[in-house]
C-alpha cells in the first residue's frame, strides 16, 4: 500500500501539502511574540509562555497537550549582592571593577528581569590572587602551560577566552590545574567579525556584551540532584556536596572592554605563539601576575550566586498515529532563554510552532500520520538540558521500546550561509533525499535544490558530490535521546561560513543583544532561511512518521564504522612499540565491521524485496531498523560517564559540543604516553577495543534474518 492508503487519507495530504502550509510570515510573527520579554528557566514569565504554547498547540489541532513539571536545581545571581571582579591594590582597595550589567539595547531600556551576566552554578566565593592567561582553557592549552612553559596555575585565578570548546570543559580543566577562580571573556578575535558593525548597527558583539551560560560537567546526568531518575514530587535528592557536575571554584564572564583592563597589565611569560593572541591591543602575556609597575596589584572575584531547587515546565503535544500509534517520532526544542532568546532558542521555537500549525491543519482536514508525533517545548536547556533529560528519565521505558527518532529544534540559524546537519548515519539518505526536493534559499542558487547549494558550500571531505554531515556531539536536547537511550537523532540549522570557528557560536550568543531585531534586521529579513530550516526539520519528521518503511539506511552506518575503525587504529599505531609489547590487536574490531557491512548489505536487499502488504513482516523489518541505534547502547555506559552509553558516539571528553567516534577507545588512548602505569593503560585500550568489537558485532546480528 502507499502511505496515503495506509493512513486512509486523500492523496493531496502528502509531504507537499505539509510543506506548502509552512509560511515564513508566520515564523516571523511567532518569533516576535516569543522574544518581547525574557523567558529565563524557573521564572513566572517562562511558565506563562509554556501555558500560551500549550493553548496554541491545542488550537492548532493536536490531540493532547500537557505540561510536565519537575523540580530541578537551577542557579541565579543574588539580586541585592551583585557579582563582579576587581583589581585591588596592595591595601586591598578596589581600583577597578567590572560592569554589573550589559547596557540594554535600544527599545529595551525599561524591560525588567534581565538577568545580569553570570556563570550558572558557580559556587560563591571571593578569591583573590595573581592572574594567568590560559588561552581557550582547552586540554592542549593547559598542556602547553604546564608541560612546555612550566607555569603552575595552582592557587591562581585564570582568565580564559570563550570559544572552541564548551565553557564547562574550560572550568573543569582550570579546576584540575589547581586554579582558585576562572574569568571567562569574549575576545573580538572570536566574537567580532571583521567589517561588521557592533549591535545595534550590525551583528557583532559590543565591548559591553557578555556571554552567559552554565559551567556544569553533567555528562548527561540531567538534574544534578537526581541523576538517572526524574525530579518529581517524591524524588530523593542528593545533598549539594554529592550533586553531579557542579564546579568547585568561582567563575564569572565579562566582555572585552573589561577584559582589556585585566589583560593590559599582564606580565610574566610572553604568549607561546600567535595562536594564543586575540585581537585586543594587549600583549597577551601569560603571567602569572601583572607587569612591573602593577606587580603588587591582584585580581579579586566577588561571586554571590545561589543554587535553588525550582519548578520547570515542559510542554508535550501529541498527534496520534493512525496505524502505529505506539511508534513515536519526536520533534523537540527548548523554550527557556538567557534573556530575549532572539536566536537561541526562539528562532527554533518559532519554527516548531509553525510545524505544529501545519500538521494541525492537515489533521483538521482528516489526515493523520502513520506513527505518533510528539512535539516538545523543553524547559531549562540552558541550565544543563534539564527539561528534556528529566522527561526522558520519566518516560525511558516507553521511549526505549517505542522511540523511532528524535529531531532537535534549537536555534534555526547561527548564520545565513548554508545548511548544517548533524545526525545519525541512519538518517543520511533521508537528509540527502529531502534536500534534493527542497528549493535553495541562497542567493545565486535560484531554481536550484537545497542539496545543490549545500553541497557546493559545504562539501563532504570524503565523498565528492555530497554535502558534509557531522557527528552528533552534545550541548543540546537530543543528548538524552541519542547518547543515553540510543534513539536515532538529528538536527539541522542554517550556519555561517566560518569552519575554523565552529564551536564559538555567533557573536551575540547568550547576550542581551540577541533580540528579534537582530534576526529581522541582520540575519534573515525575509525569514527565508527560517522557512528552509522548517522545511528540513518538518520534512524529516513527516517522512519518519509517515513512510511505510522507515527511511533509515543501515549501509551508511557500515561506511562510517569502517571510517571510525580506520581512524582509531591509526591513532593507536602512533605507539607502535607499545602495540607490539602489549599485543594490542584491532583484528576483532575490523572483523566486526566487516561482518556488519555484509549483514547490512543483505538486510538492505531483503528490505527491497519483502512483501510490504504483510503488516507483520513490515513491522518486523521496521523494528529491526528502529532498534539498530539502540543496539549500539552499552548498558554499563562509558568509563566514569554512565549516562553516555552509545559505543560509537559520545560527546568529546575535552569538548561537550563535539562528537567523538569510538569514544571508549579514544579516551583510553588519549595522552597514554603520560600514564604512570603503561601496562594498565594499554590493558584498558584492549578492553575498550573488545567492548567496541562486541557491540558492533552484536548490532550486526540484530540485522540478520530473525530465524
Amino acid at each position: 500500500k502507499s502511505s496515503n492508503e495506509a493512513t486512509n487519507i486523500t492523496p493531496k495530504h502528502n509531504m507537499k501539502a505539509f510543506l506548502d502550509e509552512l509560511k515564513a510570515e508566520n515564523i516571523k510573527k511567532f518569533l516576535y511574540n516569543f522574544t518581547q520579554i525574557p523567558h529565563l528557566a524557573g521564572t513566572e514569565q517562562n511558565f506563562q509562555l509554556a501555558k500560551q504554547i500549550q493553548s496554541q498547540w491545542k488550537e492548532f489541532g493536536l490531540d493532547s497537550v500537557e505540561l510536565a513539571h519537575y523540580d530541578v536545581l537551577l542557579s541565579y545571581p543574588n539580586k541585592t549582592h551583585p557579582n563582579y571582579i576587581s583589581i585591588i591594590n596592595e591595601d586591598g582597595n578596589e581600583i577597578f571593577n567590572t560592569s554589573l550589567f550589559e547596557p540594554p539595547p535600544p527599545g529595551y531600556e525599561n524591560v525588567s528581569d534581565i538577568v545580569p551576566p553570570f556563570s550558572a552554578f558557580s559556587p560563591q566565593g571571593m578569591p583573590e590572587g595573581d592572574l594567568v592567561y590560559v588561552n581557550y582553557a582547552r586540554t592542549e592549552d593547559f598542556f602547553k602551560l604546564e608541560r612546555d612553559m612550566k607555569i603552575n596555575c595552582s592557587g591562581k585565578i585564570v582568565i580564559a577566552r570563550y570559544g572552541k570548546v564548551f565553557r564547562g570543559n574550560k572550568v573543569k580543566n582550570a579546576q584540575l590545574a589547581g586554579a582558585k577562580g576562572v574569568i571567562l571573556y569574549s575576545d573580538p578575535a572570536d566574537y567580532f567579525a571583521p567589517g561588521v558593525k557592533s549591535y545595534p548597527d550590525g551583528w557583532n558583539l559590543p565591548g559591553g556584551g557578555v556571554q552567559r551560560g552554565n559551567i556544569l560537567n553533567l555528562n548527561g546526568a540531567g538534574d544534578p540532584l537526581t541523576p538517572g531518575y526524574p525530579a518529581n514530587e517524591y524524588a530523593y535528592r542528593r545533598g549539594i556536596a554529592e550533586a553531579v557536575g557542579l564546579p568547585s571554584i568561582p567563575v564569572h564572564p565579562i566582555g572585552y572592554y573589561d577584559a582589556q583592563k585585566l589583560l593590559e597589565k599582564m606580565g610574566g611569560s610572553a604568549p607561546p605563539d600567535s595562536s594564543w593572541r586575540g585581537s585586543l591591543k594587549v600583549p597577551y602575556n601569560v603571567g602569572p601576575g601583572f607587569t612591573g609597575n602593577f606587580s603588587t596589584q591582584k585580581v579579586k572575584m566577588h561571586i554571590h550566586s545561589t543554587n535553588e531547587v525550582t519548578r520547570i515546565y515542559n510542554v508535550i503535544g501529541t498527534l496520534r498515529g493512525a496505524v502505529e500509534p505506539d511508534r513515536y517520532v519526536i520533534l523537540g526544542g527548548h523554550r527557556d532563554s538567557w534573556v530575549f532568546g532572539g536566536i537561541d532558542p526562539q528562532s527554533g521555537a518559532a519554527v516548531v510552532h509553525e510545524i505544529v500549525r501545519s500538521f494541525g491543519t492537515l489533521k483538521k482536514e482528516g489526515w493523520r500520520p502513520r506513527r505518533t508525533i510528539l512535539f516538545a517545548s523543553w524547559d531549562a536547556e540552558e541550565f544543563g538540558l534539564l527539561g528534556s533529560t528529566e522527561w526522558a528519565e520519566e518516560n525511558s521505558r516507553l521511549l526505549q521500546e517505542r522511540g523511532v527518532a528524535y529531531i532537535n529544534a534549537d536555534s534555526s540559524i547561527e548564520g545565513n550561509y548554508t545548511l548544517r546537519v548533524d545526525c545519525t548515519p541512519l538518517m543520511y539518505s533521508l537528509v540527502h533525499n529531502l534536500t534534493k526536493e527542497l528549493k535553495s534559499p541562497d542567493e545565486g542558487f535560484e531554481g536550484k535544490s537545497l542539496y545543490e547549494s549545500w553541497t557546493k558550500k559545504s562539501p563532504s571531505p570524503e565523498f565528492s558530490g555530497m554535502p558534509r554531515i557531522s557527528k552528533l556531539g552534545s550541548g543540546n536536547d537530543f543528548e538524552v535521546f541519542f547518547q543515553r537511550l540510543g534513539i536515532a537523532s538529528g538536527r539541522a540549522r542554517y550556519t555561517k561560513n566560518w569552519e575554523t570557528n565552529k564551536f564559538s557560536g555567533y557573536p551575540l550568543y547568550h547576550s542581551v543583544y540577541e533580540t528579534y531585531e537582530l534576526v529581522e534586521k541582520f540575519y534573515d529579513p525575509m525569514f527565508k532561511y527560517h522557512l528552509t530550516v522548517a522545511q528540513v526539520r518538518g520534512g524529516m519528521v513527516f517522512e519518519l512518521a509517515n513512510s511505510i518503511v522507515l527511511p533509515f539506511d543501515c549501509r551508511d552506518y557500515a561506511v562510517v564504522l569502517r571510517k571510525y575503525a580506520d581512524k582509531i587504529y591509526s591513532i593507536s599505531m602512533k605507539h607502535p612499540q607499545e602495540m607490539k609489547t602489549y599485543s594490542v590487536s584491532f583484528d576483532s574490531l575490523f572483523s566486526a565491521v566487516k561482518n556488519f557491512t555484509e549483514i547490512a548489505s543483505k538486510f538492505s536487499e531483503r528490505l527491497q524485496d519483502f512483501d510490504k502488504s504483510n503488516p507483520i513482516v513490515l513491522r518486523m523489518m521496521n523494528d529491526q531498523l528502529m532498534f539498530l541505534e539502540r543496539a549500539f547502547i552499552d548498558p554499563l555506559g562509558l568509563p566514569d560517564r554512565p549516562f553516555y552509553r552509545h559505543v560509537i558516539y559520545a560527546p568529546s571528553s575535552h569538548n561537550k559540543y563535539a562528537g567523538e567516534s569510538f569514544p571508549g577507545i579514544y579516551d583510553a588512548l588519549f595522552d597514554i604516553e603520560s600514564k604512570v602505569d603503561p601496562s594498565k593503560a594499554w590493558g584498558e585500550v584492549k578492553r575498550q577495543i573488545y567492548v567496541a568489537a562486541f557491540t558492533v558485532q552484536a548490532a550486526a546480528e540484530t540485522l540478520s534474518e530473525v530465524a
Epitope: 581512524k567 587504529y569 599505531m573 602495540m579 590487536s585 584491532f586 572483523s591 565491521v593
Partner: nanobody
Framework: EVQLLESGGGLVQPGGSLRLSCAAS????????LSWVRQAPGKGLEWVSS????????DYADVVKGRFTISRDNSKNTLYLQMNSLRVEDTAVYYC??????WGQGTLVTVSS
C-alpha cells in the same frame, strides 16, 4: 595464516626516492587498515603512516608529511609507501603492519651519500 612481505628497500642518496611494497595474504585485505612503522638503528619503533580501506583515508607522522605517500591496491592485495626527498635520518627497517599484531619481517632502507 596472515603473511606480510615487504620489498623495495635499498641504498639511496639523500634527496632520492624509493617505493616500498608490502604483499599481503591470508586475510581479507580490503577489510583492514594498514600501517608502515620503522625502526632506525639503535632506536625504538616509530610510526610512519596509516591508510584506511581506500586511498582517501591516510595519516602521516609529521616528520614524513609531504615527502611520503601511502597507498594501496586492493585488487593486488598490496600496500605501498612512496618515499621522496629522502634524508639520512630516514634510514631504518620499514615494517608493514596489519591490525597491530601482525608485522612483516621488514625491509631495510639506507639513505647515505
Amino acid at each position: 595464516e596472515v603473511q606480510l612481505l615487504e620489498s623495495g628497500g635499498g641504498l639511496v642518496q639523500p634527496g632520492g626516492s624509493l617505493r616500498l611494497s608490502c604483499a599481503a595474504s591470508g586475510f581479507s585485505f580490503s577489510s583492514y587498515a594498514l600501517s608502515w612503522v620503522r625502526q632506525a638503528p639503535g632506536k625504538g619503533l616509530e610510526w610512519v603512516s596509516s591508510i584506511g580501506e581506500n586511498n582517501a583515508t591516510t595519516d602521516y607522522a609529521d616528520v614524513v608529511k609531504g615527502r611520503f605517500t601511502i597507498s594501496r591496491d586492493n585488487s593486488k592485495n598490496t600496500l605501498y609507501l612512496q618515499m621522496n626527498s629522502l634524508r639520512v635520518e630516514d634510514t631504518a627497517v620499514y615494517y608493514c603492519v596489519k591490525d597491530g599484531v601482525h608485522w612483516g619481517q621488514g625491509t631495510l632502507v639506507t639513505v647515505s651519500s
